[in-house]
């Protein structure tokens, strides 16, 4: 007896974080034997959509012409072959930005940081929110941070980083959100450029330093500040 059909692969183009009004295409790739593809959205009647496969039948396209709140959420897809339905794909979490006004991002004590010291990025919203996220441009995993630790509504969240090294340098933005829908984020904050300098005593980069002259570990750009991953936006460090 043959085992269960292998699960398909589900992804979104141009990505899984989409601004309000922009288009997104969800792809489900199965096998050449697929006869039909089905897309299910969590907390929506199943199936959310069905599509015939595109030649050579190993994938199907589900199009969203204009992103709105209704499309944000968690998706899985399946395919049907002559022997039955496949296992579900791993989930795809489609996040919409632009649901709320943009927060403000600042660096304490300053966006100019000496290697080996600390910096705290502060994300502030005009209205109380319960989730704040920090992202770094051009990172291997662009969405880097966890949910704000506090469940209570608040106007700001602090993202501590220590010790700072050159890899922390770059452009950051933050988002705010409400816990009732993890898939709806604010407009992004204006960018904040974090500039990391060497120590005053030894400005030249050096692979090995005594901490009396310089400091600062961490190849990974950022680490968690809270206890619960933000749905759809978790960085893969575990």
């Amino acid at each position: 007896q043959a085992g269960p059909l292998p699960k398909p692969t589900l992804w979104a183009e141009p990505g899984s974080v989409i601004s309000w009004g922009n288009s997104v295409t969800i792809w489900c790739q199965g096998t050449l034997e697929a006869r039909e593809y089905r897309l299910d959205k969590e907390e929506s009647p199943a199936p959310w959509d069905r599509q015939n496969p595109l030649e050579p039948k190993n994938k199907a396209r589900f199009s969203i012409p204009s992103m709105t709140e209704d499309y944000a959420g968690r998706y899985r897809c399946y395919y049907r072959s002559p022997v039955g339905w496949s296992q579900p794909s791993d989930p795809l979490e489609l996040v919409m930005t632009g649901a709320y006004s943009k927060p403000t991002l600042s660096a304490l004590p300053s966006p100019l940081v000496t290697s080996g010291k600390s910096v705290t990025l502060l994300c502030q919203s005009r209205s109380p929110m319960d989730t704040f996220l920090l992202i770094k441009e051009r990172a291997a995993h662009p969405l880097l941070h966890l949910r704000s630790e506090h469940g209570a509504q608040q106007h700001q969240a602090e993202f501590p980083m220590s010790p700072v090294t050159s890899v922390h340098g770059g452009t950051y933005r933050c988002f705010s959100s409400h816990g009732f829908s993890h898939y709806l984020l604010s407009h992004p904050s204006d960018p904040l450029e974090l500039i990391v300098s060497g120590s005053l005593e030894d400005p030249r980069p050096s692979p090995t330093r005594s901490v009396s002259t310089a400091a600062g570990p961490e190849d990974q750009p950022l680490m968690p500040t809270g206890s619960v991953p933000h749905s759809g936006l978790r960085r893969h460090w575990e």
Epitope: E218, P224, E238
Partner: antibody, heavy 118, light 107 residues
Framework: EVQLVESGGGLVQPGGSRKLSCAAS????????MHWVRQAPEKGLEWVAY????????YYADTVKGRFTISRDNPKNTLFLQMTSLRSEDTAMYYC???????????WGQGTSVTVSS | DIQMTQTTSSLSASLGDRVTISCRAS??????LNWYQQKPDGTVKLLIY???RLHSGVPSRFSGSGSGTDYSLTISNLEQEDIATYFC?????????FGGGTKLEIK
């Protein structure tokens, strides 16, 4: 479950050498910076050395600089501390610990004891 | 280097008590203050990071507060398993430094 297990401790003569190891499991070792921290008998904790996830950045406390070398083997999920020119004041329990990136060390090993004595 | 001072080296309390342990830094450490628990067998665990954030799996009876140079750890309802030595650590600037520890004992 995150686990850090140190080994390699023992009795060493003054001026001698010793290499400590820390075997990591339960997390993606290659994405975390790592520390060595030590504790002399009946004393407090003392930070010793740090290595970033990709080994590009290394730092030492002044008390061990030039004598100790921290390194790591990411494919083998192992952290090392090579100790040379050992002194009696290096006698301590040596712990490896994982760095959070927020100024803390979130998981620690059980420690390995190094005694420097003739 | 930043010096960390825990003025109380040992503390006796009764089960159920509210216990506060203090820590002072020689300069402003901008809330980069962490608390660790070391059990008699040598096991070290992170309790609180960045002054007040509870590490995952740590009971909610532990809390932290402070700013600038003065920080504290509070255990709201002391339990037998809390008997340990508590260390503060600054993560603001390398070299990271620890307080001398506060040993908590049962009355």
């Amino acid at each position: 479950e995150v686990q850090l297990v140190e080994s390699g401790g023992g009795l060493v003569q003054p001026g001698g050498s010793r290499k400590l190891s820390c075997a990591a499991s339960g997390f993606t070792f290659s994405t975390f910076g790592m520390h060595w921290v030590r504790q002399a008998p009946e004393k407090g904790l003392e930070w010793v050395a740090y290595i970033s996830s990709g080994s590009s950045t290394i730092y030492y406390a002044d008390t061990v600089k030039g004598r100790f070398t921290i390194s790591r083997d990411n494919p083998k999920n192992t952290l090392f501390l090579q100790m040379t020119s050992l002194r009696s004041e290096d006698t301590a329990m040596y712990y490896c610990a994982r760095s959070t990136g927020t100024g803390a060390m979130d998981y620690w090993g059980q420690g390995t004891s190094v005694t420097v004595s003739s | 280097d930043i010096q960390m001072t825990q003025t109380t080296s040992s503390l006796s309390a009764s089960l159920g008590d509210r216990v506060t342990i203090s820590c002072r830094a020689s300069q402003d450490i901008s809330k980069y203050l962490n608390w660790y628990q070391q059990k008699p067998d040598g096991t070290v665990k992170l309790l609180i990071y960045y002054t007040s954030r509870l590490h995952s799996g740590v009971p909610s009876r532990f809390s932290g507060s402070g700013s600038g140079t003065d920080y504290s750890l509070t255990i709201s309802n002391l339990e037998q398993e809390d008997i340990a030595t508590y260390f503060c650590q600054q993560g603001n600037t390398l070299p990271w430094t620890f307080g001398g520890g506060t040993k908590l004992e049962i009355k």
